[in-house]
Amino acid sequence: RSRWMKRYLTYRIYNYTPDMKREDVDYIFQKAFQVWSDVTPLRFRKLHKDEADIMILFAFGAHGDFNYFDGKGGTLAHAFYPGPGIQGDAHFDEAETWTKSFQGTNLFLVAVHELGHSLGLQHSNNPKSIMYPTYRYLNPSTFRLSADDIRNIQSLYGAPVKPPSLTKPSSPPSTFCHQSLSFDAVTTVGEKIFFFKDWFFWWKLPGSPATNITSISSIWPSIPSGIQAAYEIESRNQLFLFKDEKYWLINNLVPEPHYPRSIYSLGFSASVKKVDAAVFDPLRQKVYFFVDKHYWRYDVRQELMDPAYPKLISTHFPGIKPKIDAVLYFKRHYYIFQGAYQLEYDPLFRRVTKTLKSTSWFGC
């Protein structure tokens, strides 16, 4: 049977259906790939140019292979088994009305099915399987792979590699709240918040009294101590870590190969020797990088630094004075850490709304 002979795969959405917003299409495919990565060791990375392992396209009729689309209804899409070139690619009939709901044809459900083929799965004769050849609507928000699907995909790739377990909870030491504590970097990681300091990090669930501490090397042996900036793109399960002129990508808690990469590949000028803090704003789809008295803004959709940057922090973030240790995005606010204190900042109204101790997250 056909399967990919590597764990890390790339995909590219070559073109977009006009039926939906681009960001909805991006999100749907990210979630469709996640359905398969959740139950296997496979990891998927989106490319914006060049040839990817899995090319995704929307087309009418004849579109470069022998399998012409047939107009509305009938064949909704097709995909090729793993391999080079056209193999692994997934084609969607543009004559369908693609949606994210029960109306028209639900793109997520068809994408999960077609990507199953792209990963090497054949059709199933089990009507509960997503690989059953006939389309039927299921609620995407409650969608689960059938036991058959999981068994079949794991027969090709095995079960997921367990992320290293974080150490069991412990209460903060009694001295913790009495220290004037500063952090190197702070970011959400899924539902948790990670507070990096030297060679370790604290992590906790907001609202939970328990605090946990883990050394960086015990969970990610390839990541150095002294992380200086971090941010998460939660919709992609991606965590970015920065130290000096390098950055690392952690995907689903697993470090990606081919990292670290140079921060200059992101568009920083040569004068930038390290990033003090970074934060991803999901509403704007921008990353804000804080460097001394300035900040840079990076567009994650275009994978480009925005023009006309850097800009002065003090001018564009009223009430914020450099230098910044760390920034956290949480519930539509930025938490800007400076020494033993943090400023709660509302980016919508561009103002500081609270001043707190850095350790307020720990129930201090």
């Epitope: 579109h63 470069g64 022998f66 399998n67 097709h78 083929h117």
Partner: antibody, heavy 122, light 103 residues
Framework: EVQLLESGGGLVQPGGSLRLSCAAS????????MHWVRQAPGKGLEWVSY????????HYADSVKGRFTISRDNSKNTLYLQMNSLRAEDTAVYYC???????????????WGRGTLVTVSS | DIQMTQSPSSLSASVGDRVTITCRAN??????LNWYQQKPGKAPELLIY???SLQSGVPSRFSGSGSGTDFTLTISSLQPEDFATYYC?????FGQGTKLEIK
């Protein structure tokens, strides 16, 4: 090593019939889409027909539709092209070519046979 | 239906020359274009698939580029064994061929 060997070509009169065979080895024949491509003397390449791995799906160029039939015998690792109602313009070297595996054909011909010459003349 | 237009139909060049052959589709074929080399009396051989991927065993002086409707095959430094006919192809459609001859 992948090998494709065509046979069955020859001289035939207009309106006559001929059956070409292509013996395949070096790969799991039943997993792959297979094609026939032809080349008239001194001319370019022209795709003729393809068949899916199980033989259930076939596709033909307009120029041969209704006259040619592609088939396969996976137990014998052999591809066939039954050519009826032959015309002078069917004179060509006929090549069999291997495509990618799976339910759909890409038309990526990664291995070709040496070809067999079919001459239609009175 | 999709049509492929290949140019030039013939080309004279010398050993060591850089040569470019182009292929144009009348509608987008994404990156689904292949290039073949055929020598007299022989079967065609796959050189480039998916517009830019080099088939195993093909010398690196051959390269392909393009996507959508416009594609090129480039031979960076012609060798004596490269004088042949070249075809672009997508699915059931071949270009008319480019005969590369010694100047």
């Amino acid at each position: 090593e992948v090998q494709l060997l065509e046979s069955g070509g020859g001289l035939v009169q207009p309106g006559g019939s001929l059956r070409l065979s292509c013996a395949a080895s070096g790969f799991t024949f039943s997993d792959y889409n297979m094609h026939w491509v032809r080349q008239a003397p001194g001319k370019g390449l022209e795709w003729v027909s393809y068949i899916g791995p199980s033989g259930g799906y076939t596709h033909y160029a307009d120029s041969v539709k209704g006259r040619f039939t592609i088939s396969r015998d996976n137990s014998k690792n052999t591809l066939y092209l039954q050519m009826n109602s032959l015309r002078a313009e069917d004179t060509a070297v006929y090549y069999c070519a291997k495509d990618i595996r799976g339910a759909y054909s890409s038309g990526l011909f990664d291995y070709w046979g040496r070809g067999t010459l079919v001459t239609v003349s009175s | 239906d999709i049509q492929m237009t290949q140019s030039p139909s013939s080309l004279s060049a010398s050993v060591g020359d850089r040569v470019t052959i182009t292929c144009r589709a009348n509608q987008s074929i994404y990156t689904y274009l292949n290039w073949y080399q055929q020598k007299p009396g022989k079967a065609p051989e796959l050189l480039i698939y998916a517009a830019s991927s080099l088939q195993s065993g093909v010398p690196s002086r051959f390269s392909g580029s393009g996507s959508g409707t416009d594609f090129t095959l480039t031979i960076s430094s012609l060798q004596p064994e490269d004088f042949a006919t070249y075809y672009c192809q997508q699915a059931g459609i071949f270009g008319q061929g480019t005969k590369l001859e010694i100047k």
